[in-house]
Amino acid sequence: HTDLSGKVFVFPRESVTDHVNLITPLEKPLQNFTLCFRAYSDLSRAYSLFSYNTQGRDNELLVYKERVGEYSLYIGRHKVTSKVIEKFPAPVHICVSWESSSGIAEFWINGTPLVKKGLRQGYFVEAQPKIVLGQEQDSYGGKFDRSQSFVGEIGDLYMWDSVLPPENILSAYQGTPLPANILDWQALNYEIRGYVIIKPLVWV
């Protein structure tokens, strides 16, 4: 694994090929999670930020930007969207959490919580995922669509199997995250596919 502290994945072009596979040995279904990362893009169209598919299950967990100021979370093919007033283009720190028992999903944008939404109460997110940055999967690890591809930079990505309390979300935003047990930017197992470059993080 690699400590990517102070670095980002740069996706320099629109494509149907360029992506990063994130590798985790996640063995049991997720009842809760929190995902945080930083992103910087000047795309005004829709694009995928984090695509998590399992065998035979598309959009099992997907973080998707619909347009400026609109973020969507898919859980088991169901979707909620939260809105925020944001500058464009501008760097953003995104956290999203979901809790199976209540179905509550919550986005935090730059350390500020958005309106909570609910979906898939009682559902468990399947384990053994293929996780892709840069493209939106329509199959297990593939079937990409250029029009949903990400162009820009992503870094500081962490994923926990719990709903983090607000103070820990703010710690992540401020650059001092808790140790993460699903994906950890400081100990990341990944595979670069296509034209993706690792560069220093210069926009925080």
Partner: antibody, heavy 119, light 107 residues
Framework: QVQLVQSGAEVKKPGSSVKVSCKAS????????MHWVRQAPGQGLEWIGM????????NYNEKFKSRATLTVDKSTSTAYMELSSLRSEDTAVYYC????????????WGQGTLVTVSS | DIQMTQSPSSLSASVGDRVTITCKAS??????VAWYQQKPGKAPKALIY???YRYSGVPSRFSGSGSGTDFTLTISSLQPEDFATYYC?????????FGQGTKLEIK
Amino acid sequence: QVQLVQSGAEVKKPGSSVKVSCKASGYTFTSYWMHWVRQAPGQGLEWIGMIHPNSVNTNYNEKFKSRATLTVDKSTSTAYMELSSLRSEDTAVYYCARRNDYYWYFDVWGQGTLVTVSS
Amino acid sequence: DIQMTQSPSSLSASVGDRVTITCKASQNVNSNVAWYQQKPGKAPKALIYSASYRYSGVPSRFSGSGSGTDFTLTISSLQPEDFATYYCQQCNNYPFTFGQGTKLEIK
């Protein structure tokens, strides 16, 4: 096989410093966080801090932040832990331990280095 | 810092006994707990990670459970080589902290 071999026992005077080494073999040294843990005689385990050999990023237990320094020598696959301003309560066995590939636990440990602080 | 409180601190048992050691965290640590075994004069060895997963090569008589604040390590049928000291460790927050240990002795 994966191994961490530590330097030998040390006897130090109060106020002095000690530098313990931990030589890694059998795996890619620069790919795994190295942690340091100590154990006072007859006591439990206490986490000192961790270092990533490739980025040289560190994270310390606040208790040791002002006195402990973690470093690495990539050319020899060796990690070091230096503790300054030693006092009698620093008498302990100091262990290096490798973080697992995916999870935050320690899957490989050094054999330990006894540091005795005595006037 | 998160306190990890183990109980009992020592325990006498016989070969073949079923033994349970508990560890209580002072705040929620989710499932981010590991268990280690240590024998006198030796370094600790990993037994369990993520509260319930056995480290490779660890016999199936060792099992872990729990989440949140309460965790247990169970040895289903004690073997002579299991007499040692056991430590829990939380890796949910920095600094990582350990329990004070449970010494398992032969009755």
